[in-house]
Interface confidence: low
């Protein structure tokens, strides 16, 4: 199905406008901001979601990176250029002609420049590290229960193939979820790890993108898992290119 037929809504993206004007009167949904048709049987790309959310307040994060080539989304929200498939265009610019290159999750991977800046290809983010800190609980969660619950969540809620959840690490109160997906591993129809991570990030913040579903109620053996801090690191297949000035 492309969208819920009964009331013509998009189960996987509430930031859409839907109407029964598809072939044969089928429900068709278009993303706000871009007007692009979306497939409501799967996650909408992060680029189209950011475009729909362009007027939302800025969200910046600045904690220490876990490796020299990991990227953190310090720039927050911007109105991105998306290609006809809904992916980020390799080069993004703001309305005052400041341009930069991004990776496949839309995070800046070069210094900022002007219109003469070239971004020859969209570099794939193949490794995402989601770093969570949970609120204090009576005791630590059982690691294998936590692992199983988070894998189930990514499989069922975000439709991410289990093979892309590389590992779940736990050292109370820190949980780390590793998502890995090389270009060669991603088959047609596979959810992108960047899109799954973005949906998860929004769920954790209580800003679910799903239509009509309640917020994320994460429980491990019945015990609520409440996240008080999230930090996401992105590792690209080709290391980012920042000047030494930025790195110091």
């Amino acid at each position: 199905h492309t969208a819920a037929q009964d009331n013509c809504t998009c189960p996987t993206n509430k930031m859409t406008v839907c109407s029964p004007d598809g072939p044969g009167g089928r429900c068709q949904c278009r993303a706000l901001g871009s007007g692009m048709a979306v497939d409501c049987s799967t996650l909408t790309s992060k680029c189209l979601l950011l475009k729909a959310r362009m007027s939302a307040p800025k969200n910046a994060r600045t904690l220490v990176r876990p490796s020299e080539h990991a990227l953190v989304d310090n720039d927050g929200l911007y109105d991105p250029d998306c290609d006809p498939e809904g992916r980020f265009k390799a080069r993004q610019c703001n309305q005052t002609s400041v341009c930069w290159c991004v990776n496949s999750v839309g995070v800046r991977r070069t210094d900022k420049g002007d219109l003469s800046l070239r971004c020859d290809e969209l570099v794939r983010t193949h490794h995402i590290l989601i770093d969570l800190r949970h609120r204090p609980t009576a005791g630590a969660f059982n690691h294998s229960d936590l692992d199983a619950e988070l894998r189930r969540l990514f499989r069922e809620r975000y439709r991410l193939h289990p093979k892309f959840v590389a590992a779940v690490h736990y050292e109370q109160p820190t949980i780390q979820i590793e998502l890995r997906q090389n270009t060669s591993q991603k088959a047609a129809g596979d959810v992108d790890i960047g899109d799954a991570a973005y949906y998860f990030e929004r769920d954790i913040k209580g800003e679910s993108l799903f239509q009509g579903r309640g917020g994320l109620d994460l429980r491990v053996r019945g015990e609520p898992l409440q996240v008080e801090r999230t930090l996401i690191y992105y590792l690209d297949e080709i290391p980012p290119k920042f000047s030494m000035k930025r790195l110091t």
Epitope: K89, R91, Q92, D114, R118
Partner: antibody
């Protein structure tokens, strides 16, 4: 509606300078870039440079660096192109054109009527 | 600099014909290509931007397609007012560059 009105035709001697103006109306001047393009008689279009009217910063094509100055007066919504050390090959129609600022907006949606500059001794 | 090569440089056609003009970029310019129409003694007019988007007020008989290095402007059914010179332009990177033009004449 959006309009760009350019100054009148000019005849100049080799080595002289010319300054062409382009007055914008129908939109907020500082929300769009102003580009300059020229067209020699019977020839194609050649981009000369532009000014970011928001920041006031110009950028020039390599072939014109050192000879061209692009400026803007936001109080009168007017952009200017000054070309110095004129040569006979600079005889052309000079156009101003409005563009956007962001990465996908560097096409020219509104053009001035053009100003013919003739360089002749 | 990115070279934009148009073909053909001139072409003769009749009212009602379907006409295609192509533009080849010397490097990948994504979908950042615009098409303009220019009539004698007049400024160019924007027809298509970002390869396939028709500008406001441009008749639906004009369409554009392509990405990367190869782009096409198609006029589905020529009208008398369509005889003019057509230019492509890459709006991906400075210096902004134009094709040399295609003169569309009445057969």
């Amino acid at each position: 509606q959006v309009q760009l009105v350019q100054s009148g035709a000019e005849v100049k001697k080799p080595g002289a300078s010319v300054k062409v103006s382009c007055k914008a109306s129908g939109y907020t001047f500082t929300t769009a870039g102003m580009q300059w393009v020229r067209q020699a008689p019977g020839q194609g279009l050649e981009w000369m440079g532009w000014i970011n009217t928001h920041s006031g910063v110009p950028k020039y094509a390599e072939d014109f660096k050192g000879r061209v100055t692009i400026s803007a007066d936001t109080s009168t919504s007017t952009a200017y192109l000054q070309l110095s050390s004129l040569k006979s090959e600079d005889t052309a129609v000079y156009y101003c054109a409005r563009s956007g600022f962001g990465s996908s907006y560097w096409y020219f949606h509104v053009w001035g009527q053009g100003t013919l500059v003739t360089v002749s001794s | 600099d990115i070279q934009m090569t148009q073909s053909p440089s001139s072409l003769s056609a009749s009212v009602g014909d379907r006409v295609t003009i192509t533009c080849k970029a010397s490097q990948d310019v994504s979908t950042a290509v615009a098409w303009y129409q220019q009539k004698p003694g007049k400024a160019p007019k924007l027809l298509i931007y970002s390869a396939s988007y028709r500008y406001t007020g441009v008749p639906s008989r004009f369409s554009g397609s392509g990405s990367g290095t190869d782009f096409t402007l198609t006029i589905s059914s020529l009208q008398p007012e369509d005889f003019a010179v057509y230019y492509c332009q890459q709006h991906y990177i400075t210096p902004l560059t134009f094709g040399q033009g295609t003169k569309l004449e009445i057969k």
